[in-house]
Each structure stands twice: as structure tokens, then as C-alpha cells.
């Protein structure tokens, strides 16, 4: 099948006092090979500070995956989700505390 770019969605949720969990979800992409990771000040976080979801079929002929990490509240602007798929790449910021969803369709 032809390449289908992912929709990337960054969300945040309260983790513990002073911390938040930020989750970057990529969905609706094909083929299944994808790079998804969190960066702090443009530098990739170490593997053991991130939790990855499996790349799984979504039942529509495309795939989905996610990566999450825990960060200090107030430092959101230093973190971005980096996505690379089929030669294309993009970065996605953490939404501010007021808005909980950011949808970007990557082309």
C-alpha cells in the first residue's frame, strides 16, 4: 500500500505533586516503521526515562503507537515529541495547561 502519514497527538495528565505525564500518540500511519521519542531542549531523552507502546494495527489497515514520559510541571516548553516516518519528520510541543489535546496531521 501507499504511505499514509501519522496523525500526532500530544496530551498531558497529572502524575504526582509537581509532575505531569506527557503522552505522544501517533496513529493512522502506514507502513508500520516509525520513530517516536521525547526530546528535552532538542536532545533525545534516555531510553529508560520513556515508556513506549507497541506498534499495533488499528483495524483500518494502518498502525498506531505512543511514547510517554514524566516531566516537571512548568518545564513543558522544553519538551517536544519527535516523529519520523517514511523519510519525513516533525516535532510536536506539549500543550499548555489549559488545552489538553493537540492534533497535527503530518504531511
Amino acid at each position: 500500500g501507499s504511505t499514509v502519514p501519522p496523525m500526532v497527538n500530544v496530551t498531558r495528565s497529572e502524575a504526582s505533586e509537581g509532575n505531569i505525564t506527557v503522552t505522544c500518540r501517533a496513529s493512522g500511519f502506514y507502513p508500520w516503521n516509525i520513530t517516536l521519542s521525547w526530546r528535552q531542549d532538542g536532545v533525545s531523552l534516555s531510553h529508560d526515562t520513556q515508556q513506549w507502546g507497541d506498534v499495533l494495527p488499528d483495524g483500518n489497515g494502518t498502525y498506531q503507537t505512543w511514547v510517554a514520559t514524566r516531566i516537571c510541571q512548568g518545564e513543558e516548553q522544553r519538551f517536544t515529541c519527535y516523529m519520523e516516518h517514511s523519510g519525513n519528520h516533525s516535532t510536536h510541543p506539549v500543550p499548555s495547561g489549559n488545552s489538553h489535546h493537540h492534533h497535527h496531521h503530518h504531511h
Epitope: S27, W32, L56, P57, D58, G59, N60, Q64, W66, A68
Partner: antibody, heavy 122, light 112 residues
Framework: QGQMQQSGAELVKPGASVKLSCKTS????????ISWLKQKPGQSLEWIAW????????SYNQKFTAKAQLTVDTSSSTAYMQFSSLTTEDSAIYYC???????????????WGQGTLVTVSA | DVLMTQTPLSLPVSLGDQASLSCRSS???????????LEWYLQKPGQSPKLLIY???NRFSGVPDRFSGSGSGTDFTLKISRVEAEDLGVYYC?????????FGGGTKVEIK
């Protein structure tokens, strides 16, 4: 972990259809893959199909593609399986089970409903 | 379809014994994403199955550490280090890597 409450036992006639439900609570429904499984008395389990509640996308065991149809109602956090053209071979317990995609477990059937007994008899 | 073969069919044990259950798949069960979705479930009479082990060797939350899973390729093992009364029932292995997902025929662990 939340709850998965399945509908009650069904006694149906051959050739008829039945729609089983799996009502969920206590977790984010749209984050889950909901599977349906079949078990005849004293036998092993058979996977029928899954539906990803977030999109309604499905994957079927080819053996059941003409027999089963999976749907979800996100407003009531309920998964359904319509089973058609029933024969006595379809008499079994049917389970729903879920995989929480954004949870910590990479297991397909981490949590189960209590099962629904379907009896097909003239 | 991937055939999952479990041995033995029945495993008589004494409480406190170690039990070893085997599961063999008819082909390699590594998923396209690199994971091996080999899981173990325990079903007691009149109950729904319960997850014990996922991805070959990961214990599910709340599962006692006397349960351990191992294996790779096509051969997998579930070990119970000291069998307790609550461990009696039918154990099923399952592969969720290749559609259609398939279960083994089960191993019944019972008192000797």
C-alpha cells in the same frame, strides 16, 4: 482495572441471530482493544475478533467473518457482537476481554467479562 | 493458522511441588513489531480465564512471583515454583502475534 459486564444467557433457535453486549466502566473505553472469544464446555478457547474502540477498526478470525459482527457504542462504553445464522455448533460461552493500549500491560486479554452462555436449540 | 500444542494434557501435583508446563507453537511467533505475544492464562471451573504472564515472561499485576514464564522461538514454558491449592485449574497458552490468534488445548493441573 474497571468492570466488564456481559449480557445474560440466551436461548435461541437455529437460524436466528443474537446480539451480545459487554458494558464497561471504570476505564477509558476508547483506549481499548475489545476482543470476543468462544469456549465450548470442556474445551479450549477460540479468538473470534477484536475491535479497537478508539476508531471502530476490526480484525477477525477468518473462521468467523461470516458469522460475527463487532461494533461499539462509545456513548455508553459498550461493545457488541452480533452472531448470525446460528447452529448448534455455536452453543458456547462467549467472553469479552480487553487490552488497555495505553496501560502498562502488553497483554491482549488483561481483563475479562464474566461470559454469556448461548444455547442454540430447536 | 499457528497451532499451539500444550503438554502434558494433565499434570498431577502435590501441594508445594514445582510444576512445569510446556507450550510449543507450529511456527515462530514474533510479531512484525518485534514483540512475542505469548501469554499464559489460568481458568478455574465456572470462572473466566485470568491472565498470568504476557510477552513470554512478564508477570501481570497481582500475579505471585512463584509463576514464571520463559522461552523463545517456538518453545515456551510456564513454571510454578511451589504449587498452592489456588493454582489448580486449566492453564492455556496463547499466541497473539499472528492472526488468527490461537490458544493451546490446555494443561489441567490437579492434585495427585
Amino acid at each position: 482495572q474497571g468492570q466488564m459486564q456481559q449480557s445474560g444467557a440466551e436461548l435461541v433457535k437455529p437460524g436466528a441471530s443474537v446480539k451480545l453486549s459487554c458494558k464497561t466502566s471504570g476505564f477509558t473505553f476508547s483506549d481499548n482493544y475489545i476482543s470476543w472469544l468462544k469456549q465450548k464446555p470442556g474445551q479450549s478457547l477460540e479468538w473470534i475478533a477484536w475491535i479497537y474502540a478508539g476508531t471502530g477498526g476490526t480484525s477477525y478470525n477468518q473462521k468467523f467473518t461470516a458469522k460475527a459482527q463487532l461494533t461499539v457504542d462509545t456513548s455508553s462504553s459498550t461493545a457488541y457482537m452480533q452472531f448470525s445464522s446460528l447452529t448448534t455448533e455455536d452453543s458456547a460461552i462467549y467472553y469479552c476481554a480487553r487490552h488497555d493500549y495505553y496501560g502498562t500491560s502488553g497483554a491482549w486479554f488483561a481483563y475479562w467479562g464474566q461470559g454469556t452462555l448461548v444455547t442454540v436449540s430447536a | 493458522d499457528v497451532l499451539m500444542t500444550q503438554t502434558p494434557l494433565s499434570l498431577p501435583v502435590s501441594l508445594g511441588d514445582q510444576a512445569s508446563l510446556s507450550c510449543r507453537s507450529s511456527q515462530n511467533i514474533v510479531h512484525i513489531n518485534g514483540n512475542t505475544y505469548l501469554e499464559w492464562y489460568l481458568q478455574k471451573p465456572g470462572q473466566s480465564p485470568k491472565l498470568l504472564i504476557y510477552k513470554v515472561s512478564n508477570r501481570f499485576s497481582g500475579v505471585p512471583d512463584r509463576f514464571s514464564g520463559s522461552g523463545s522461538g517456538t518453545d515456551f514454558t510456564l513454571k510454578i515454583s511451589r504449587v498452592e491449592a489456588e493454582d489448580l485449574g486449566v492453564y492455556y497458552c496463547f499466541q497473539g502475534s499472528h492472526v488468527p490468534w490461537t490458544f493451546g488445548g490446555g494443561t489441567k493441573v490437579e492434585i495427585k
